[in-house]
């Protein structure tokens, strides 16, 4: 298995892979495949309403890029120790000891898994090739950001040879084959987006290649600067009792997602007042409605938040509120 | 003036369909999510369904998850509520309504009576 | 869901006496932005429902003054200062905060 894979973004595209080589492999690594598949936003944030009050917003952060070339900081696995910056004690004859026999364990286990478990396979080279493994039950990593992790995983025992499905039925998971280094850079990836990413490690460079169980790591993409601005001018209608229905285009390829609008509204002479549209709320509205507003001019600006912060506000949009019998000076969604 | 006027009420066994519809005039029908609300018998009222102003997105009650579809037509300034697999506990008087979202329902249709017997 | 309290369910008045309602939500109706989304509407009987009170305390248009709503956080009330006979019927309370929307079970107010 290759070992410490780490994964970091430097721009909104690109996800740089490194890791070490097997500590004990079978025969002479000959390449390494990575294999790479967008991971979708957890569900609990289309349906959550993140403008209820006390309610945090999501934390995404990208991964971050390295610190130097052996840091981890940012790039944890779940196997490593996070005790911080001190010194590893000089080690006891007991541990010595006992590394060599663990040492042993996975040669031996890793003998097994290339006997038993695995069945060799066919794949052809090159990105956008098939991916003719079995497959395997997605695990649940969590909040991929500034950690990424590294899980080595037993596939189920295979019942058929080398024809099984695909992870996702009719999707061809690009991969990439490295040869004769540790590193990879992925590029031509969506922005501010998970990425589950695939390494094993190969000995055998023909059709019939032999490859070591997988580690997985995980990583986001950097947010792209201007995605989470509103384009295209904010719009408005002014219905009967006063009420102002607000609209504007939602972001065409956010960072991740957008879960809010800020809507900042004031009339001439008076202060902010300020309504939080959630994306429910915007689905069903295309925007949202001021109600029962006291005669003047008013000015309107809109700024989306998604899961990487705040979009840019939009250039104020103006208004007049003609005079209307009993109205109480209040706001609406 | 704003009116809504619901239609296809009726009496149905259970386990079968009914399709309602609510005739929306008065106001710009596209720009409004529209509800559905029911009232059982001497009961108070029950949210049951709401559509997006363009009808790309909706939303149910658990207790109708599944056996009812709101849709609407935008040319036609119509609402309908598809109900299948009909229950007694169904038994209500049915109201279509504008959304006012925070506010809930700013105008309200007059209802149509759906029974559920066998 | 958020769940909407009202007492009492029943409420015998005199003509030209005040009358009081309550409603209690299960969760603090506070919206992120500071607005408080508890609306009132009345139900006269065979009639379908109106509103008469947004956001606490704005009343509709050609709701008449005598209705005053008040409130905040869980606690919410409805007082009438002089109740007339157009006035009877059943009044609910319900929450625009939470998804789903969510009714109370409505206080009938009748004559005494």
């Known amino acids: 298995v290759p070992l410490d894979p780490i994964s970091v973004s430097n721009s909104s595209s690109q996800i740089i892979l490194k890791w070490k080589p097997p500590s004990d492999p079978n025969g002479n690594i000959t390449h390494y495949l990575v294999f790479w598949e967008r991971q979708a936003e957890d569900s609990e944030l289309f349906e959550l309403d993140y403008c209820l009050k006390g309610l945090k917003l999501p934390s995404r952060t990208w991964s971050p890029p390295f610190e130097s070339e052996d840091s981890q900081k940012h790039n944890q696995s779940e196997y490593e120790d996070s005790a911080g910056e001190c010194c590893s004690c000089p080690k006891t004859d007991s541990q010595i000891l006992k590394e060599l026999e663990e040492s042993s364990f996975r040669k031996t286990f890793e003998d097994y898994l290339h006997n038993v478990v695995f069945v060799p396979r066919k794949t052809s080279s090159g990105t956008g090739a098939e991916d003719p493994r079995p497959s395997r039950k997605r695990r649940s990593l969590g909040d991929v950001g500034n950690v990424t992790v590294a899980v080595p995983t037993v596939a189920a025992f295979p019942n058929t040879s080398s024809t099984s499905v695909p992870t996702s039925p009719e999707e061809h998971r690009p991969f990439e084959k490295v040869v004769n280094k540790e590193s990879l850079v992925i590029s031509g990836l969506r922005h501010f987006t998970g990425y589950r990413i695939e390494l094993q490690a190969c000995n055998q460079d023909t059709p019939e290649e032999r490859c070591s169980v997988a580690a997985y790591v995980s990583a986001r993409t950097m947010p792209e600067a201007k995605a989470d601005d509103i384009v295209g001018p904010v719009t408005h209608e002014i219905f009967e009792n006063n009420v102002v229905h607000l609209m504007w285009q939602e972001p065409k390829e956010p960072n991740g997602l957008i879960v809010l609008y800020e809507v900042s509204y004031r009339r001439y002479g008076d202060e902010e007042l300020h309504l939080c549209v959630s994306r429910k709320h915007f689905a069903l509205e295309r925007g949202c409605r001021l109600r029962g507003l006291s005669p003047g001019n008013y000015s309107v600006r809109i700024r989306a938040t998604s899961l990487a912060g705040n979009g840019s506000w939009t250039e104020p949009t103006y208004f007049y509120v003609t005079d209307y019998l009993d109205v109480p000076s209040n706001i609406a969604k | 003036e704003v009116q809504l006027v619901e239609t296809g009420g009726g009496v149905v066994q259970p386990g079968r369909s009914l399709r309602l519809s609510c005739a929306a005039s008065g106001f710009t029908f596209s720009s409004y999510a529209m509800h559905w609300v029911r009232q059982a018998p001497g009961k108070g009222l029950e949210w049951v369904a709401v559509?997006?102003?363009?009808?790309?997105?909706?939303y149910y009650a658990d207790s109708v998850k599944g056996r009812f579809t709101i849709s609407r037509d935008n040319s036609k300034n119509t609402l309908y509520l598809q109900m299948n697999s009909l229950r007694a506990e169904d038994t209500a008087v049915y109201y279509c309504?504008?959304?006012?979202w925070g506010f809930g329902f700013d105008y309200w249709g007059q209802g149509t009576t759906v029974t559920v017997s066998s | 869901d958020v769940v909407m309290t009202q007492s009492p369910l029943s409420l015998p008045v005199t003509l030209g006496q005040p009358a009081s309602i309550s409603c209690r939500s299960s969760h603090s109706l506070v919206y992120g932005d500071g607005n408080t989304y508890l609306n009132w509407f009345h139900q006269r009987p065979g009639q379908s429902p109106r509103r008469l009170i947004y956001?606490?305390?704005n009343r509709d248009s050609g709701v008449p003054d005598r209705f005053a709503g008040s409130g905040s956080g869980t606690d919410f009330t409805l007082k009438i200062s002089r109740v007339e006979a157009d006035d009877f019927g059943v009044f609910y309370c319900m929450q625009g905060t939470h998804w789903p929307y969510t009714f109370g079970q409505g206080t009938k107010l009748e004559i005494k």
């Open positions: 956001k606490v305390s």
């Open positions: 559509i997006s102003y363009s009808g790309s997105n909706k």
């Open positions: 309504a504008r959304h006012e």
